[in-house]
Interface confidence: low
Amino acid sequence: DAHKSEVAHRFKDLGEENFKALVLIAFAQYLQQCPFEDHVKLVNEVTEFAKTCVADESAENCDKSLHTLFGDKLCTVATLRETYGEMADCCAKQEPERNECFLQHKDDNPNLPRLVRPEVDVMCTAFHDNEETFLKKYLYEIARRHPYFYAPELLFFAKRYKAAFTECCQAADKAACLLPKLDELRDEGKASSAKQRLKCASLQKFGERAFKAWAVARLSQRFPKAEFAEVSKLVTDLTKVHTECCHGDLLECADDRADLAKYICENQDSISSKLKECCEKPLLEKSHCIAEVENDEMPADLPSLAADFVESKDVCKNYAEAKDVFLGMFLYEYARRHPDYSVVLLLRLAKTYETTLEKCCAAADPHECYAKVFDEFKPLVEEPQNLIKQNCELFEQLGEYKFQNALLVRYTKKVPQVSTPTLVEVSRNLGKVGSKCCKHPEAKRMPCAEDYLSVVLNQLCVLHEKTPVSDRVTKCCTESLVNRRPCFSALEVDETYVPKEFNAETFTFHADICTLSEKERQIKKQTALVELVKHKPKATKEQLKAVMDDFAAFVEKCCKADDKETCFAEEGKKLVAASQAALGL
């Protein structure tokens, strides 16, 4: 529907509060280094302008596109050149090239200080003093650190953030009330950011078709009672929402997401029996709830897939008439029958089916050629099943920290050129698959594990893309979205790697390690482990274990010592020497 003024349309649809929040998120995701106050000023100027357009849609400039209005506003930032360097060149371009240029300069790993959580009383005072600024600051800090965070979902997080402070700042024990809630929001927020980053990578690197295939598979698992036409409609709408958000069109994205939630709830009888509670909720919670809703029960007595997709004499005719629709139907039918499979496995099966039809429908006897296509699926299904079984056994044997260490060693040997912080972050996250998924029964393990690993490996891919250092990583990340995990799993030790020079400074520790949280201390030790492997990639598990055990004992001993700093200096030298000897460095 054509509106005289797009900005007025979105302002009216979303309301002033959501409009301002979404514009702030959009600006912070584009200009990640700008101070908070500058962004607030820009947002207020845009909001005042929007209000003039609501009052009179024919007013000057009200007919301009949102990209033009927002881009013009961003380009008024005086320090653009000195803060962002070549990003300032975007401002010389016209839309839509200017927006594309801004998108290309989004930084997945911006050079920003770590967010340090102040004392609870300090936070509560700040919250009570100026609630509005406090909440805007939250949006700003998250958005600039996560430039692809799903904006309407960030509004939901902000609402929960506000609620946590509203409740806990009045509690008798503020910290006991607030800190667990903030930890939960932080962990959920990181997970949400990573999941959305994969959606955007899927759209931007592999195209709309790849995203739609993912959506068909996932929605068919979730809504197995919905008919194919219904799933197709939802996929089309969902693709539009995510394309908009990934493209920086946050107002349109939030508006369309609300429309999609409304549609789903109005049509829940033909979609899923699990939506009732979600659809009772207010908008932000409703959308979040729908996105996380459990899979509906599979319809009873679904016929065999073979009838339509192998045995029918019309397979090639149906495929030729509308390839993507036919493959979409195959994916839908397979996915709704297999909530126990990961989405990426379902996509591999669909790709195998497509490849087989491409080959066989051109053969002399097509049916004879594709008759055994389902047999080709068996090894594809068994590979992730076996991998998950082995890794869950290892996790149960080692526990999370040591399981992460095993993965750190494994991945450092595969791709030793990758930076140590990236290897630590990615391997720690890979290791969390154990506690996240291994507790599930067999039928839920694969969708949990392999789809989670896709999200984590995408983090590796986007971080590596910023500063590429390994051809192997580039290859696994770019060749096939659905085969990324098997590609990384198949990598062996990189025999071409020249071990890193030994640097004693890397293994010098100080008394400050004693005051760190358990998590931070683990990260320090895991950083040292990665560096060890980079120095000695041929080191055996036993050698590395011995050195790490000595290291843990050294930290424990010196943290108990009266003169900690002296202990770290003297015992540290001994440890480095002993480690060098043990590893033959």
Partner: nanobody, 124 residues
Amino acid sequence: EVQLVESGGGVVQPGDSLRLSCAASGGTFSTYVMGWFRQAPGKEREFVSAISQNSIHTYYANSVKGRFTISRDNSKNTVYLQLNSLRPEDTALYYCAASRFTSWYTADYEYDYWGQGTLVTVSS
């Protein structure tokens, strides 16, 4: 713009009952969460009860649980609050409120529209 008008308040004795009504106009009533709040003289406004759009969820303050009942009739654009076993401490101005987007049903800042209030006095 939603308008809310409360009625049904009055003066009663401890142990008596009252039924408050709140009629809504100017919006799609069935899309709103409806809540009741009250403010006693010299005190802050406090949450009493709330009901979700299709009456699936109801919420009550601990002080009124088991005595007050909230209900709604979407065909009549009206929400009700049945007050039983009234106590002197229930004396207050009772407000009806409507919210499109609340997730924290008990928080007054989540409600967008408010009525003028109806006075309930419990005294022997």
